[in-house]
């Protein structure tokens, strides 16, 4: 996160860290807890690393430096990458992770509400992006979970800024005209959440951007509302019943 500040314990209890253990262990992506046994993240996090057993998912944590060999983590039972995602394209950057064992909810570890299907009418004015990613383009992973308040921008405005790419209706953009605040490398897959009527909702999944926090280059996020059918289909067919945290 560029231009952010330290988060507090329990402030973003749905935020998880997706880490890979090969020779060493490192944080690669963020993710959002959406049910006892489900995490929503970006499909591109698994490019070149599709093997379930190399991944460790840490939930209910604030500081990555607090992780030791004794820190509990979740393992992956199943990775469900959107069927239309292609490594050679930037569309449908969304994936579900089914955990091997369900998590108990606590003050520091609980799910984020999902938006309503095709939610286009809600005007979100209080949106935040969180993650342990770089604090500048040529930076490094941060120890303490960072947060930053970023306004949504219209897809029309976003398309003007990214003429070489197609900004689809299944994407949502956020950023300041002057730059300075944005997600960055290592924040991929993490949440863009907005507070509406007193409730936090998962509006976007951190996907891509041209550099980080550059002027007139907003961050691009997978629009969760556009994938509600897919999310429900995959979680229901795997569970027999939905265990998602949907809005009231």
């Amino acid at each position: 996160i560029v231009g952010g500040t330290n988060s507090s314990w329990g402030e973003w209890p749905w935020q998880v860290s997706l880490q890979v253990k090969l020779t060493a262990q490192r944080h690669l992506c963020g993710g959002s807890l959406i049910g006892h046994q489900w995490v929503l993240t970006a499909a591109h996090c698994f490019d070149g690393l599709p093997l379930q057993d190399v991944w460790r998912i840490y939930s209910g944590i604030l500081n990555l430096s607090d992780i030791t060999k004794d820190t509990p983590f979740s393992q992956i039972k199943e990775i469900i990458i959107h069927q239309n995602y292609k490594v050679s394209e930037g569309n449908h950057d969304i994936a579900l992770i089914k955990l091997q064992a369900p998590l108990n909810y606590t003050e520091f570890q609980k799910p984020i509400c999902l938006p309503s299907k095709g939610d286009t009418s809600t005007i979100y004015t209080n949106c935040w992006v969180t993650g342990w990613g770089f604090s500048k383009e040529k930076g490094e992973i941060q120890n303490i979970l960072q947060k930053v308040n970023i306004p949504l921008v219209t897809n029309e405005e976003c398309q003007k800024r990214y003429q070489d790419y197609k900004i689809t209706q299944r994407m949502v953009c956020a950023g300041y005209k002057e730059g300075g605040k944005d997600a960055c490398k290592g924040d991929s897959g993490g949440p863009l959440v907005c507070k509406h009527n007193g409730m936090w909702r998962l509006v976007g999944i951190t996907s891509w951007g041209e550099g980080c926090a550059r002027r007139e280059q907003p961050g691009v996020y997978t629009k969760v509302a556009e994938y509600m059918d897919w999310i429900l289909e995959k979680t229901q067919s795997s569970d027999g019943k939905a265990q998602m945290q949907s809005p009231a």
Epitope: A42, D47, S88, E89, K166, C184, K185, S188
Partner: antibody, heavy 125, light 108 residues
Framework: EVQLLESGGGLVQPGGSLRLSCAAS????????MAWVRQAPGKGLEWVSS????????HYADSVKGRFTISRDNSKNTLYLQMNSLRAEDTAVYYC??????????????????WGQGTLVTVSS | EIVLTQSPGTLSLSPGERATLSCRTS???????LAWYQQKPGQAPRLLIY???SRATGIPDRFSGSGSGTDFTLTISRLEPEDFAVYYC?????????FGQGTKVEIK
């Protein structure tokens, strides 16, 4: 199977014109940026031009700017390169290439993942 | 424009040997925009490595890419007879997209 098939090359006099075509198949053409890359005899590769999926935005190498025009017809799955005011130094094999633009580490990627077999353009009097 | 300089110009090696090809860029290049291609005489180039280190589909694991910033490397761990060809690095970080001049890997 992704296939790119160039046509339209040949011998042309300096100052003349030629239109190259590239017929694409095996993928959703309208989803991909496309490009032309050329290679003069015995020389290295040189990017010529690229065009976004919608066709609404193009890029050119300085060496061809104002003389060459890239375009596409998504309904026909075809990429074009209109070459005007041709010079001897434009003599080359012209390749049509698909531009893959994925995502990695919260940034886009960009590379030529599929190439046609090339068509030879010879500019000589 | 970003200039890519490949070295050496020619690499004379025997099958089974290790080949190390260098590509230096005149400006910082985001590794996501650095690719390597192989070209054999009379053929179109073939993608080997994208994003500086990711192998393209169907490329044997003896090919590997590494590097960041302005220094990139293509390594062929054990040369097979079919690996003798010309190799190009390429950046698409900034237009004009540019290629290195190529490194020819020839049989010693």
């Amino acid at each position: 199977e992704v296939q790119l098939l160039e046509s339209g090359g040949g011998l042309v006099q300096p100052g003349g014109s030629l239109r190259l075509s590239c017929a694409a198949s095996g993928f959703t053409f309208s989803d991909y940026m496309m490009a032309w890359v050329r290679q003069a005899p015995g020389k290295g590769l040189e990017w010529v031009s690229s065009i976004v999926p919608s066709g609404g935005h193009t890029h050119y190498a300085d060496s061809v700017k104002g003389r060459f025009t890239i375009s596409r017809d998504n309904s026909k799955n075809t990429l074009y390169l209109q070459m005007n005011s041709l010079r001897a130094e434009d003599t080359a094999v012209y390749y049509c290439a698909r531009v893959a633009r994925g995502i990695a580490a919260r940034s886009r990627t960009s590379y030529f993942d599929y190439w046609g077999q090339g068509t030879l353009v010879t500019v000589s009097s | 424009e970003i200039v890519l300089t490949q070295s050496p110009g020619t690499l004379s090696l025997s099958p089974g040997e290790r080949a190390t090809l260098s590509c230096r860029t005149s400006q910082f290049v985001n590794s996501n925009y650095l690719a390597w291609y192989q070209q054999k005489p009379g053929q179109a180039p073939r993608l080997l490595i994208y994003g500086a280190s990711s192998r393209a589909t169907g490329i044997p694991d003896r090919f590997s890419g590494s590097g960041s910033g302005t220094d990139f490397t293509l390594t062929i761990s054990r040369l097979e007879p079919e690996d003798f060809a010309v190799y190009y690095c390429q950046q698409s970080s900034r237009t004009p997209w540019t290629f290195g001049q190529g490194t020819k890997v020839e049989i010693k």
